[in-house]
């Protein structure tokens, strides 16, 4: 008998870009007249359903209707496969596909990580106490959370306060503070991504005397 | 053998539309996406829009919204690209052309002759 | 859109010398396709997914890259290679290519 096979590691997508997943029989078997399932999760949650020499759309849960393209130029050879378009952080998780003849059905099961490379973080200055720079430094649009990091001259790591919040996509924002002096020299706030290994950097230098000291009066009328 | 037949040149007046046709050959349509691709003349590729011909669903590039229909007819194994309200910029030859699929990504792979679109007063 | 920018624009090569073409994208993307373009034909497919040498090309041509920065290498130019070379990425909609570089041989 024949057995199904899918992607043999998680297969990586870019929120926003397209997915490709391909199963096929082994030994090479003709799938026209079999049925053919690609679920999310549990078999009842139908992303994509092949059936009766045709695509059966209305069996399809609503956040994937529009979205998915079953390609069938190899499916008398046993290959099937399925593009999924536009994808978001809330198509993360684990996918199968399922084919089945009238007798007997295999499936096989895979993960679908999604990521999101986030801006280069901009760093700005937000207060200025007793020659103390705060600096905050802002990026937006990664998944899942990255890795965010004050750096001192020497690469080496700063403690800093986080803030993260969700944008309505799902993807996170990040805000990291930190407190230096005037004479702190060059700092980097870095963003590393977790799954990509891939890291986004900005660099302030902060020099001896970064604001010059000034004589305020208050100017009257 | 795989192959994509575009029909032939044409020859317009502005402000005139142009259906031109992709007719496949070995290869069954409905079974991907087929995708249409503009080059002006000495300049570069830049995608029009795909129709899946299974079921009419089409997507265009922001540029050709309201300048292209991509259509297909399944029975003939066709796919239709017509550009309306014709201006000297439409003059480009136009590719028809198929995803292929590798098992894990996609990339244009089946390609038509191109056909020559001038426009013309 | 993602906005792919090829450089340079034209590059001249010798037979049998070593060139790179680069291909940089405005966003991330997945995957960089390359196609070559000869005078009045339709463009052929050269390189798929970055890296992969398509059906029939010879392996003087191979492809590198990741993230924003794609670049394709010949590794002894051939008279034969003279042609428009095109980045195109096919991860997110609207699909896109790059302006292309043409290739002549001295």
């Known amino acids: 008998q024949w057995q199904v096979f899918g992607p043999d590691k998680p297969v990586q997508a870019l929120v926003g870009e397209d997915a490709a997943f391909s199963c096929f029989l082994s030994p090479k078997t003709n799938a026209e007249a079999m049925e053919v399932r690609f679920f999310r999760g549990q078999f009842s949650s139908v992303v994509h359903l092949y059936r009766d020499g045709k695509d059966q759309p209305f069996m399809q849960m609503p956040q994937y209707q529009g979205r998915t393209k079953l390609v069938k130029d190899s499916i008398a050879e046993g290959r099937i496969s399925l593009r999924l378009e536009n994808i978001t952080v809330l198509d993360a998780g684990l996918y199968g596909c399922r084919i089945s003849s009238q007798s007997y059905y295999q499936k096989a099961i895979w993960e679908l990580q999604v990521s999101a490379l986030g801006s280069v973080p901009l760093i700005s200055i937000t207060g200025y106490v007793d020659r103390d720079i705060q600096l905050l430094c802002q990026s937006s649009g990664w998944f899942p959370r990255p890795t965010a990091k004050w750096k001192g001259p020497q690469g080496q790591d700063l403690s800093t306060d986080s803030r993260t919040n969700r944008d309505m996509h799902g993807l996170f924002d990040v805000e990291i503070s930190l407190t230096v002096q005037e004479n702190a020299g060059s700092i980097s706030c870095s963003m590393r991504h977790a799954h990509l290994s891939r890291e986004v950097e900005s660099r302030v230098q902060i020099g001896d005397t970064f604001f010059e000291p000034i004589s305020w009066h208050l100017a009257t009328k | 053998e795989v192959q994509l037949q575009q029909s032939g040149a044409e020859f317009v007046r502005p402000g005139a539309s142009v259906k031109m046709s992709c007719t496949g050959s070995g290869l069954n349509i409905e079974d991907d996406y087929m995708h249409w691709v503009k080059q002006r003349p000495e300049q570069g590729l830049e995608w029009i829009g795909r129709i899946d011909p299974a079921n009419g669903n089409t997507k265009y590039g922001p540029k050709f919204q309201d300048k292209a229909t991509i259509t297909a007819d399944t029975s003939s194994n066709t796919a239709y690209l017509q550009l309306s309200s014709l201006t000297a910029e439409d003059t480009a030859v136009y590719y028809c052309?198929?995803?292929?699929?590798?098992?894990?990504?996609?990339?244009?792979?089946?390609w038509g002759q191109g056909t020559t679109l001038t426009v013309s007063s | 859109q993602i906005v792919l920018t090829q450089s340079p624009a034209i590059m001249s090569a010798s037979l049998g010398e070593e060139i790179t073409l680069t291909c940089s994208a405005s966003s991330s993307v997945s995957y960089m396709h390359w196609y070559q373009q000869k005078s009045g034909t339709s463009p052929k497919l050269l390189i798929y997914?970055?890296?992969n040498l398509a059906s029939g090309v010879p392996s003087r041509f191979s492809g590198s890259g990741s993230g924003t920065f794609y670049s394709l290498t010949i590794s002894s130019v051939e008279a034969e290679d003279a042609a428009d070379y095109y980045c195109h990425q096919w991860s997110r909609y609207p699909y896109t290519f790059g302006g292309g570089t043409k290739l002549e041989i001295k």
């Open positions: 052309t198929r995803n292929y699929y590798d098992g894990s990504l996609y990339y244009f792979d089946y």
């Open positions: 997914s970055t890296s």
